[in-house]
């Protein structure tokens, strides 16, 4: 079954900026990848970045650069203006989406004892909603 | 979450007709185009049939143009496709989706389970 895995990492060098990074774990080629904050796409979320595996990208403040890794991985960096850096306490979710076979996606946050530098465990974390025949979690 | 229902495939005679309907509920909209797409045979890429963006622009494929319509309901959430002159090629599964403009093409983020069109000869 595909995965999504999702990891925050804070900048060690500046604790304003987020690293967001983001992976599908199974077959199939990606025809765009989605990346929000404060709960998932389309349930509340706020949308940061839109990737395109050939067409390019589009983002939105405070997204600062978004990026493919590999061919099943971004990464989106982050730019905390506020002096009380609320990304410290904030979901990011990354949708995967393979038309039309099915989307996939999860969430994750910085953990709360994280040191800067590091990163949080690469374990998907499933939002869990009703079931569309084509979108697993 | 997304709920996209495709409704009005069917089986027709080449020369006829069909009028598929798509209604989203359940979603914030967050993306900038919706339309019908298909899998296009032996294409890795979904292949955009009509696209229409939230400036109202339409985009056909060029095998389509002048055959089939893309319009909107009472709202944004409502979504058709009269489909005329119907051939044996466009046999497939249409998919209604919502998406986002790249380069003027709409990529699709969100689609139903899709409805069946059979054109026979």
């Known amino acids: 079954t595909p995965e999504v895995w999702v990891q925050v990492q804070m900048e060690a060098t500046e604790l304003s900026s987020f690293t967001v990074h983001c992976g599908f774990l199974g077959p199939g080629s990606i025809s765009l990848v989605t990346v929000s904050w404060g709960g998932p796409d389309g349930a509340g979320g706020t949308k940061l970045a839109v990737l395109h595996p050939e067409l390019g990208t589009r983002q939105w403040a405070p997204a600062r650069q978004a990026r493919w890794e590999t061919q099943s991985s971004i990464s989106l960096a982050l730019e905390d203006s506020g002096a009380s850096s609320p990304f410290a306490n904030t979901t990011f979710c990354c949708k995967f989406a393979s038309f039309p076979e099915g989307s996939w996606e999860s969430c994750g946050s910085l953990p709360p004892s994280s040191d800067p530098g590091l990163s949080a465990p690469p374990t998907p974390v499933p939002i869990l909603r009703a079931d569309h025949h084509h979108h697993h979690h | 979450h997304v709920q996209l229902v495709e409704s009005g495939g069917g089986s027709v005679q080449a020369g006829g007709s069909l009028r598929l309907s798509c209604e989203a509920s359940?979603?914030?909209?967050?993306?900038?185009?919706m339309g019908w797409f298909r899998r296009a045979p032996g294409k890795e890429r979904d292949e955009g049939v009509a696209?229409?963006?939230?400036?109202?622009?339409?985009k056909y494929a060029d095998s389509v143009k002048g055959r089939f319509t893309i319009s909107h309901g009472n709202g944004k959430y409502i979504l058709y496709l009269q489909m005329n002159s119907l051939k044996p090629e466009d046999t497939d599964m249409y998919y209604c989706?919502?998406?986002?403009?790249?380069?003027?093409?709409?990529?699709?983020?969100?689609w139903g389970q899709g409805t069946q069109v059979t054109v026979s000869s």
């Open positions: 359940g979603y914030s909209y967050s993306g900038d185009c």
């Open positions: 989706a919502a998406g986002w403009t790249f380069g003027g093409n709409c990529s699709p983020a969100d």
């Open positions: 696209t229409i963006d939230n400036a109202g622009r339409i």
